[in-house]
């Protein structure tokens, strides 16, 4: 059974992930972003189901494409390099989903824009956090 300290750790990691995803969304979904129109042409795979931490496997598998889109952005739009930002997210995702269980991600039929993709995972984080608090 999860202890209160492990629940607290999970909550903090989810809050960190949430903040990172919201910061990326804020840098992209903005009228001052000169590459917004171009970025919206990229398609991302969405999870068929995302209700448990193991479903973060679906986010992990899309981190490389996410980094490629972020590389389009001007450096002044991101105070961290996309590679470092994605690396930070990857570390948190690996810790949260755990490496001992192998989960095959199932994707929805419809692909999504980067904004829809980020909003989906932001909602996921918020939903899990709300069950922990």
């Amino acid at each position: 059974a999860p202890t209160s300290s492990s629940t607290k750790k999970t909550q903090l990691q989810l809050e960190h992930l949430l903040l990172d995803l919201q910061m990326i969304l804020n840098g992209i979904n903005n009228y001052k972003n000169p590459k917004l129109t171009r970025m919206l042409t990229f398609k991302f795979y969405m999870p068929k189901k995302a209700t448990e931490l193991k479903h973060l496997q679906c986010l992990e598998e899309e981190l490389k494409p996410l980094e490629e889109v972020l590389n389009l952005a001007q450096s002044k739009n991101f105070h961290l390099r996309p590679r470092d930002l994605i690396s930070n997210i990857n570390v948190i995702v690996l810790e949260l989903k755990g490496s001992e269980t192998t989960f095959m991600c199932e994707y929805a039929d419809e692909t999504a824009t980067i904004v829809e993709f980020l909003n989906r995972w932001i909602t996921f984080c918020q939903s899990i956090i709300s069950t922990l608090t």
């Epitope: 910061m23 804020n26 979904n29 903005n30 009228y31 001052k32 917004l36 129109t37 991101f78």
Partner: antibody, heavy 120, light 111 residues
């Protein structure tokens, strides 16, 4: 002094069109992004649309997308808002506001506004 | 869209006394460039909006130091240290971290 002056408002029937203008003076118009923001009678502020300093990008609120078009003429220091298929809910005071995307001030200068009334 | 919720919606204050307005965002407003684009605007009766504070706490030129902005992440506050008659009007928080949105406004009036 730095000034934005809107014009072109008036009373118009639903479904008709109207074009608003915003004349800028006292600053280098061509380096500023420009917004239109509206305020319905007795209500709060609602962002409508923005255009980049060079006209290269424009974005719209969902409520006006496909009906309103923002444009600018940097040689005339003028911003425009073409409003088509007007609805009763477009009734508002329309303000133009400038923003230097690099300064981080946000919308630092606003016009006095022009009133649009959509009524049959 | 980012939703900004202001409280209170009305604030009757005594001249010379302080006033405080809160603005809560549905999303973190920190941009990937490290800045937080949260502004405060003042709209006096019959006038257009006027910029008071930008990036949470920076007073715009000509704004008296009676006006102070603070906050972080999702919670922001505008304080007027000593309310004067000319401060009467509606105050809006506004974010430009994503596409611009405004709070509903807080009406400051004299008791």
């Amino acid at each position: 002094q730095v000034q934005l002056v809107e014009s072109g408002g008036g009373v118009v029937q639903p479904g008709r069109s109207l074009r608003l203008s915003c004349a800028a003076s006292g600053f280098t118009f061509s380096i500023y992004g420009m917004h239109w923001v509206r305020q319905a009678p007795g209500k709060g502020l609602e962002w409508v649309t923005v255009i980049w300093y060079d006209g290269s990008n424009e974005y719209y609120a969902d409520s006006v997308k496909g009906r309103f078009t923002i444009s600018r003429d940097n040689s005339k220091n003028t911003l425009y808002l073409q409003m088509n298929s007007l609805r009763a809910e477009d009734t508002a005071v329309y303000y133009c506001a400038r923003e230097d995307f690099d300064s981080h001030y946000g919308m630092d200068v606003w016009g006095q506004g022009t009133t649009v009334t959509v009524s049959s | 869209d980012i939703v900004l919720t202001q409280t209170p919606l009305s604030s009757p204050v005594t001249l010379g006394q302080p006033a405080s307005i809160s603005c809560r965002s549905s999303h973190h407003l920190i941009h990937s460039d490290g800045n937080t684009y949260l502004s405060w605007l003042q709209q006096r009766p019959g006038q257009p909006p006027r910029l008071l504070i930008y990036k949470i706490s920076n007073r715009f030129s000509g704004v008296p130091d009676r006006f102070t902005g603070s906050g972080t992440g999702t919670d922001f506050t505008l304080k007027i240290s000593r309310v004067e008659a000319g401060d009467v009007g509606v105050y809006y928080c506004m974010q430009t971290t994503q596409f611009p949105t405004f709070g509903q406004g807080t009406k400051v009036e004299i008791k």
